[in-house]
């Protein structure tokens, strides 16, 4: 662990209450193929424990979705990954909209610091799939 | 190689016969920019030779495709990446559908073990592009 | 740096003049969360300074876009990432079209050599978003 190989891959636990757009994650071998090795979960949100540059990746699939599902709704469905605490470091890191599609997937490199908590906000009224091969979120430390 | 930096990037060779949804891959410098350094190919399927956590990524583009191509067909076109052997470890790792789109691309972290064979199943009746910049599949060992 | 951990994450600076399909990138902590550690920018294009296998990733979002924006235009909007110089190594590495979608995102492993300059060509007449969480481009050295 001293090499700084912090890494995590999470699966969706549940969505938040109505006014909370955050997705709540879970991880651990007992749950399937998700795991946390270094980072930790704080009430379903991912907290970084080691400074460095990380590869952040995410895939979110909407539940029982067809290409018309996303266009049927007036409010666009958007997924944003960002640092939500500490407040002084709050920023959106990655943002995608579901445009007549049912899945978004992306990745990016970003500097993260010990104590940064990442939030994944799904705006709109569509429910995400909890299937572990359709919706997942992970980080990988790549260098100091 | 003792560092465990197993890595592979493959290009599409061909699709299977009608009842076989698997894509068959090939790799090697003579073919272009694909390569295998550690993992190996077994009849077009990727076999892992070192335990660890891997970043698995894939992009598949449908051949001569427009936004209506995917909606034209009754059966949805879906790509799933999974462990197909040994049977005791069979599981779907990553799944995406082409919803009025012509390309899917995603990536995820997952634990893999020596001997795991990864299959990429394309369901539906649309032919994938063999262009090496449009369709590719790869794995990268990231930590033990 | 001697470990060869070359890495860069760039944000969009501007598009080229009409006959130049290239996107012009910028990076550095003063600009936000973009950075260059090893690779360098040459007139907005990313130049590699160390041989090796790299993970190349990109996300491009079209500005003020809805699902009809991309289908409204006769010429398809396509993003291609390739080596544009030296001319002897010119090749397309990764290509995606916006089919009734507003964002493309993908990644791949590819061998790159010192002096390779990567270009990101956006064909079509739609303007990309400059928001740093919507459009970004990066490379990460992963092994020799």
């Amino acid at each position: 662990e001293s090499l700084g190989w912090d890494i995590a891959e999470l699966q969706l636990n549940h969505t938040g209450p109505q006014q909370d757009p955050r997705l709540y994650w879970q991880g651990g071998p007992a749950l399937g193929r998700s795991f946390l090795r270094g980072p930790e979960l704080d009430k379903g949100q991912l907290r970084i424990r080691r400074d460095g540059i990380y590869m952040v990746h995410i895939q979110v699939t909407l539940a029982i979705c067809s290409s018309t599902s996303t266009s049927r709704h007036h409010h666009p469905t958007t997924l944003a990954v960002g640092i939500c605490s500490p407040a002084s470091r709050s920023i959106s890191l990655l943002r995608l909209s579901f445009h007549q599609g049912c899945t978004i997937a992306s990745q990016r490199l970003t500097p993260l610091a010990r104590g940064d908590t990442l939030c994944t906000n799904l705006t709109g009224t569509l429910l995400p799939s909890r299937n572990t091969d359709e919706t997942f979120f992970g980080v990988q430390w790549v260098r100091p | 190689e003792s560092l465990g930096w197993d890595i592979a990037e493959l290009q599409l060779n061909h699709t299977g016969p009608q009842q076989d949804p698997r894509l068959y891959w090939q790799g090697g410098p003579a073919l272009g920019r694909s390569f295998l350094r550690g993992p190996e190919l077994d009849k077009g399927q990727l076999r892992i030779r070192r335990d660890g956590i891997y970043m698995v990524h894939i992009q598949v583009t449908l051949a001569i495709c427009s936004s209506t191509s995917t909606s034209r067909h009754h059966h949805p076109t879906t790509l799933a990446v999974g462990i197909c052997s040994p049977a005791s470890r069979s599981i779907s790792l990553l799944r995406l559908s082409f919803h009025q789109g012509c390309t899917i691309a995603s990536q995820r972290l997952t634990p893999l073990a020596r001997g795991d064979t990864l299959c990429t199943n394309l369901t539906g009746t649309l032919l994938p592009s063999r262009n090496t910049d449009e369709t590719f599949f790869g794995v990268q060992w990231v930590r033990p | 740096e001697s470990l060869g951990w070359d890495i860069a994450e760039l944000q969009l600076n501007h598009t080229g003049p009409q006959q130049d399909p290239r996107l012009y990138w910028q990076g550095g902590p003063a600009l936000g969360r973009s950075f260059l550690r090893g690779p360098e920018l040459d007139k907005g294009q990313l130049r590699i300074r160390r041989d090796g296998i790299y993970m190349v990733h990109i996300q491009v979002t079209l500005a003020i876009c809805s699902s009809t924006s991309t289908s409204r235009h006769h010429h398809p909007t396509t993003l291609a990432v390739g080596i544009c110089s030296p001319a002897s190594r010119s090749i397309s590495l990764l290509r995606l079209s916006f089919h009734q979608g507003c964002t493309i995102a993908s990644q791949r492993l590819t061998p790159l050599a010192r002096g390779d300059t990567l270009c990101t060509n956006l064909t079509g007449t739609l303007l990309p978003s400059r928001n740093t969480d919507e459009t970004f481009f990066g490379v990460q050295w992963v092994r020799p």
């Epitope: - | 599409l12 583009t61 051949a63 001569i64 009746t125 649309l126 032919l127 994938p128 063999r130 090496t132 | -």
Partner: antibody, heavy 120, light 111 residues
Framework: QVQLKQSGPGLVQPSQSLSITCTVS????????VHWVRQSPGKGLEWLGV???????DYNAAFISRLTISKDNSKSQVFFKMNSLQADDTAIYYC??????????????WGQGTSVTVSS | DIVLTQSPASLPVSLGQRATISCRAN??????????MHWYQQKPGQPPKLLIY???NLDSGVPARFSGSGSGTDFTLNIHPVEEEDTATYYC?????????FGAGTKLELK
């Protein structure tokens, strides 16, 4: 074995419409597309249009204003209707199944053909 | 529309010899790593029969004496050795874009 059987009139009056039914067996119309092609001594083989598993259609732009292709999956039938026929529409009309790959657009099984003469 | 030009229009061949039929497109029909050219055989009073798809793939049940090659704009159908039952008209067809178009045909006859 896969079969496509066509039924329709042999003689059509000028300016009238042509209707042909293609009844298929041993494959599903919800999976496979069905093309329509005609053949005449003067123009050779001409592709007219196709109806896909999902019910979507693609037409040859030269015929789009007077051609309709539809189907009834439950009856395994595809319907072809062309309006405003003229003498140069005299031809043998074929239905043909799209090859397994939906974006390949090759035709692997054909109906026996319907010989149509446009004449008063 | 893509125009396909077949040559020759008529091809007399002796039994056991090689027959070579050419099909040229006025623009490339190759894309996505494939060549979207197909070949059909038609005998009098019968509908066309698919022989080869994607330039070189034999359809099921087609004898191995049939082979196809080519890419871009130039394609070839070879029959070797020619047998008596191969007397027919052969058509090429592209599927690179709509509308699909066919060549005018090559009539293979025995010398």
């Amino acid at each position: 074995q896969v079969q496509l059987k066509q039924s329709g009139p042999g003689l059509v009056q000028p300016s009238q419409s042509l209707s042909i039914t293609c009844t298929v067996s041993n494959f599903s119309l919800s999976t496979y597309g069905v093309h329509w092609v005609r053949q005449s001594p003067g123009k050779g083989l001409e592709w007219l249009g196709v109806i896909w598993g999902g019910g979507y259609t693609d037409y040859n732009a030269a015929f789009i204003s007077r051609l309709t292709i539809s189907k009834d999956n439950s009856k395994s039938q595809v319907f072809f209707k062309m309006n405003s026929l003229q003498a140069d529409d005299t031809a043998i009309y074929y239905c043909a199944r799209n090859n397994y790959y939906g974006n390949l657009y090759a035709m692997d099984y054909w109906g026996q053909g319907t010989s149509v003469t446009v004449s008063s | 529309d893509i125009v396909l030009t077949q040559s020759p229009a008529s091809l007399p061949v002796s039994l056991g010899q090689r027959a070579t039929i050419s099909c040229r497109a006025n623009k490339s029909v190759s894309a996505s790593g494939y060549s979207f050219m197909h070949w059909y055989q038609q005998k009098p009073g019968q509908p066309p029969k698919l022989l080869i798809y994607l330039a070189s793939n034999l359809d099921s049940g087609v004898p191995a004496r049939f082979s196809g090659s080519g890419s871009g704009t130039d394609f070839t159908l070879n029959i070797h050795p020619v047998e008596e039952e191969d007397t027919a008209t052969y058509y090429c067809q592209h599927s690179r874009e709509f509308p699909l178009t066919f060549g005018a045909g090559t009539k293979l006859e025995l010398k």
